[in-house]
Interface confidence: medium
């Protein structure tokens, strides 16, 4: 933003320093320089002298007019040409901003990731405002009527320790900037209903010899939630369409899921879980790759997530790293 300077006059913007993008605006510059009747007043935008749409109003004041101003930010200053002065004399400067009022925040979602100790609330902020926009998240206990407010620029993490007004809450979001304010609908939550189990992870895969070769995917989660429903999706890397298998899971031991897959094809697997009967899913796990052997395997071997593998009695893929899934939108 603008830093403190000693002005020899005044610069102001109509209708305001922050205004709606696309508006017509006027910037006024009024000189107050000792022993100087300005011959000329100059306006600079981002350091470049403006040539057009400048009107001299009186001996000390000039106006610069912009039609349909679309720049999100500009630094303006004005100078005067004084008689007997070799250089232009600085009058004053101002930062101006254009943007939009906030949209109504929607899709307000609050979840508690198991072991995180936080309730994470997110929302769709709508179109880009271009100007500083703040969000106030209101959390009101339906049992005690106590209301807490949290100021943020994006999402918010609220410590579950601070949610001491029971289990039921109303959550809503207010968006505000210099051009307007909007408020979301209220979301009613029950803390027990919004827990997302600890992430499920695929650890390895193997294709074993049988009448029809089958691939076993090993996967696990550190969750302490007893009733968990999971989905595993898989596809050949050359395909667009996913196949999905559903499981009711007990994570007291590592899960083994069997698949009958085509030979000599690279497959990708992902898994996600939710507490059975609840609303929110985990995001899909990292991509896990496994290539099936060419024909019925003969000898034992291991392979990693990459393409390297040897045909054998057991063809294995071991998770050695994580490629981030792009499916974070599956929470809702």
């Amino acid at each position: 933003g603008i830093t403190n300077i000693n002005c020899s006059g005044h610069i102001w913007v109509e209708p305001a320093t922050i205004f709606k993008m696309g508006m017509n605006i006027s910037i006024y510059c009024q000189a107050a320089i000792k022993n100087c009747q300005p011959r000329k007043l100059h306006f600079y935008k981002n350091g470049i002298k403006e040539r057009f749409q400048i009107t001299r109003i009186n001996k000390t004041t000039a106006r610069l007019w912009y039609k349909n101003f679309l720049e999100p930010h500009a630094s303006m200053y004005c100078t005067a040409e004084c008689p007997k002065h070799f250089q232009e004399t600085l009058i004053c400067g101002k930062d101006i901003s254009s943007g939009y009022p906030p949209d109504i925040p929607d899709e307000v979602t609050c979840v508690i990731y198991e072991y995180s100790g936080n309730m994470t609330c997110t929302w769709n902020a709508g179109k880009l405002t271009y100007i500083d926009t703040k969000y106030v998240v209101h959390v009101k206990s339906l049992e005690t009527e106590e209301e807490q407010q949290y100021l943020t620029s994006s999402y918010i993490n609220i410590s579950t320790d601070s949610l001491q007004g029971g289990k039921k809450y109303l959550v809503w979001v207010q968006a505000a900037n210099a051009l307007g304010m909007e408020e979301s609908k209220q979301l009613q939550i029950h803390l027990d209903d919004i827990v997302i189990p600890s992430a499920a992870v695929i650890s390895r895969a193997e294709t074993i010899n049988a009448t029809v070769p089958k691939t076993i995917i090993y996967w696990d989660s550190q969750t302490t939630i007893e009733k968990v429903s999971c989905e595993m999706r898989y596809k050949a890397t050359t395909n667009q369409t996913w196949n999905v298998k559903e499981f009711d899971t007990n994570f007291t031991y590592v899960q083994q899921s069997e698949f009958y897959l085509e030979p000599n094809i690279k497959y990708v697997f992902q898994v996600r879980c939710q507490e059975t009967g609840k609303r929110y899913w985990q995001p899909w796990s990292s991509l896990f790759f496994h290539k099936t052997p060419e024909t019925v395997p003969q000898v034992t071997s291991k392979a990693f997530q990459h393409d390297t593998w040897n045909s054998g009695l057991t063809v294995a893929s071991i998770s050695t790293g994580h490629l981030t899934s792009d499916n974070r939108g599956d929470i809702g």
Epitope: G1, I2, T3, N46, G47, E50, C78, D95
Partner: antibody
Amino acid sequence: DVQLQESGPGLVAPSQSLSITCTVSGFSFNTYAITWVRQPPGRGLEWLGVLWPGGGISYNLALKSRLTISRDSSKSQVFLEMNSLQTDDTARYYCARNWRHYDGSYAMDFWGQGTSVTVSS
Amino acid sequence: DIVLTQSPLSLFVSLGDQASISCRSSQSLVHSNGNTYLHWYLQKPGQSPKLLIYKVSNRFSGVPDRFSGSGSGTDFTLKISRVEAEDLGVYFCSQSTHVPWTFGGGTRLEIK
């Protein structure tokens, strides 16, 4: 004569903040803009931002969330602050005076010698 | 952001020969006021950059007349008519028409 002198910490730990001072002499803030530029070892120049004579600031948007440029006119100093530093912020940081041609052409006519900043644990 | 692409990356020239460096912009550098704010800098080994040419073709004070700039719109050229030993270093083009200001990647001039 015109001089610009940068002073910085030299070594900064990752995730920490950087503060560099540019002390100028031989000209007035009210006539010239001051620009900050950095140059990673063996690489090209990257524009960080400019402090205009009117006191306004334009930032490189890619870095704006981590950058603050300010000044203390009484001490003829301009400040660059950058937070959440990572190893790829290792560079020589320059301040430069912007010479304004009569039509407002800002080209950097005088540069400081730069201050080397290494981000490392 | 405006991307400035310089070519060649390196230039090997014999003393007394001519050298030519190109700078191409991803967008026109003509400002709405009609001016083109394209500048050239030279950074000698171990030194800060120095201004050579401002606004396409204007030599900065103290810059020898063997340096000349030309071009318009998106294509610009810096020429050194007779290369001297003191000219070696990295040449950068830069634009200040649009914020953020940007620099080209640099052209290293080396003596054969």
